[in-house]
């Protein structure tokens, strides 16, 4: 499956939108930095077949979409930017879903990377727990925004490697 060129443009647009969403000085939030244990090894792209990589990417984008679709998120961010960001993620999900079906086959379940998908889900559970513990404070959201920018950058790099393999 060849992800359309618009997909990588969408990736960049999502990162730009996320960068624009910042509302307070980041310097005031240093004390709130947190190690969420991003599963970097799931995004290095070496041990994966393409089908596995695509389903991990899909999970990453899906979880990001879910995180920024909550009521708490709506209260934290400027609405028009949030809507544009969610639209970009939704388009990426559609692209990836088409690829998952094509690569894995409609009947086949990608059991081989359940651990990888679970690692991504647990990562987002830790992010949600952190936000809850910090009572969804502005600084907590800034830290999460910075973390998601970093994890989306890893996703973008994995997609670039997948395209080079084609």
């Amino acid at each position: 499956c060849d992800l359309p060129q618009t997909h990588s443009l969408g990736n960049r647009r999502a990162l730009i939108l996320l960068a624009q969403m910042g509302r307070i000085s980041h310097f005031s939030c240093l004390k709130d930095r947190h190690d969420f244990g991003f599963p970097e090894e799931e995004f290095d792209g070496h041990q994966f077949q393409k089908a596995q990589a695509i389903s991990v990417l899909h999970e990453m984008i899906q979880q990001t979409f879910n995180l920024f679709s909550t009521e708490d998120s709506s209260a934290a961010w400027e609405q028009s930017l949030l809507e544009k960001f969610s639209t970009e993620l939704y388009q990426q999900l559609n692209d990836l879903e088409a690829c998952v079906i094509q690569e894995v086959g409609v009947e086949e379940t990608p059991l081989m990377n359940e651990d990888s998908i679970l690692a991504v889900r647990k990562y987002f559970q830790r992010i949600t727990l952190y936000l809850t513990e910090k009572k969804y404070s502005p600084c907590a959201w800034e830290v999460v925004r910075a973390e998601i920018m970093r994890s989306l950058s890893f996703s973008t790099n994995l997609q670039k490697r997948l395209r080079r393999k084609d």
């Epitope: 980041h26 310097f27 004390k31 930095r33 991003f38 800034e142 830290v143 910075a146 970093r150």
Partner: antibody
Framework: EVQLVQSGAEVKKPGESLKISCKGS????????IGWVRQMPGKGLEWMGI????????RYSPSFQGQVTISADKSISTAYLQWSSLKASDTAMYYC??????????????WGQGTLVTVSS | DIQMTQSPSSLSASVGDRVTITCRAS??????LNWYQQKPGKAPKLLIY???SLQSGVPSRFSGSGSGTDFTLTISSLQPEDFATYYC?????????FGQGTKVEIK
């Protein structure tokens, strides 16, 4: 490959102005902050200040506030440190280094090679 | 500003020795502490971040520990290339202050 490349050594007279640079490459320049560190001859490291190139938000150490100006041009992935009126006591090696901001990653993991500034009459 | 105090300011040791450098913060910095190595004429190099995380590419003989106000950098078996000056730095609040440095010299 991540690199921070600083401008070359400078010899200046007291009262002159100066702007030194730090060019980032091999990574997303706006995703990392850039910090500046001074090291006077035979002395330790002194933290001067930091800039977020994404919006040019800047903070200075009280010791350097009003003495220097930190800026950045994200279109050319370059941060700057400048003086409007140099003093002999500004003679030092100046380093830039990148910081991951609020994301969880190693702090100041890449450094420039340093710019030696000599101020002498 | 948070003050960082390193001890000792210098030490002499032999190859193979176990070396310990301590760093104390004037107030709690949680685990937001970095350790750097600097050799003459070179830029500092990050060894340890977040008090105990080993930076990629740094030999495992280097380790860091501590939280709150008291921190330690340990070199388990000193190698010839380890003779240098070591600095701690707090990273919880601006300005990010450094310790005054510890020079490790050959005995």
């Amino acid at each position: 490959e991540v690199q921070l490349v600083q401008s070359g050594a400078e010899v200046k007279k007291p009262g002159e102005s100066l702007k030194i640079s730090c060019k980032g490459s091999g990574y997303s320049f706006t995703s990392y902050w850039i910090g500046w560190v001074r090291q006077m001859p035979g002395k330790g490291l002194e933290w001067m200040g930091i800039i977020d190139p994404s919006d040019s938000d800047t903070r200075y150490s009280p010791s350097f506030q009003g003495q220097v100006t930190i800026s950045a041009d994200k279109s050319i992935s370059t941060a700057y440190l400048q003086w409007s009126s140099l003093k002999a006591s500004d003679t030092a090696m100046y380093y830039c280094a990148r910081h991951p901001g609020l994301a969880w990653a190693p702090d100041f993991d890449y450094w420039g090679q340093g710019t030696l500034v000599t101020v002498s009459s | 500003d948070i003050q960082m105090t390193q001890s000792p300011s210098s030490l002499s040791a032999s190859v193979g020795d176990r070396v310990t450098i301590t760093c104390r913060a004037s107030q709690s910095i949680n685990r937001f502490l970095n350790w750097y190595q600097q050799k003459p004429g070179k830029a500092p190099k990050l060894l340890i971040y977040a008090a105990s995380s080993l930076q990629s590419g740094v030999p495992s003989r280097f380790s860091g520990s501590g939280s709150g106000t008291d921190f330690t950098l340990t070199i388990s078996s000193l190698q010839p290339e380890d003779f240098a000056t070591y600095y701690c730095q707090q990273a919880i609040d601006l300005p990010f202050t450094f310790g005054q440095g510890t020079k490790v010299e050959i005995k």
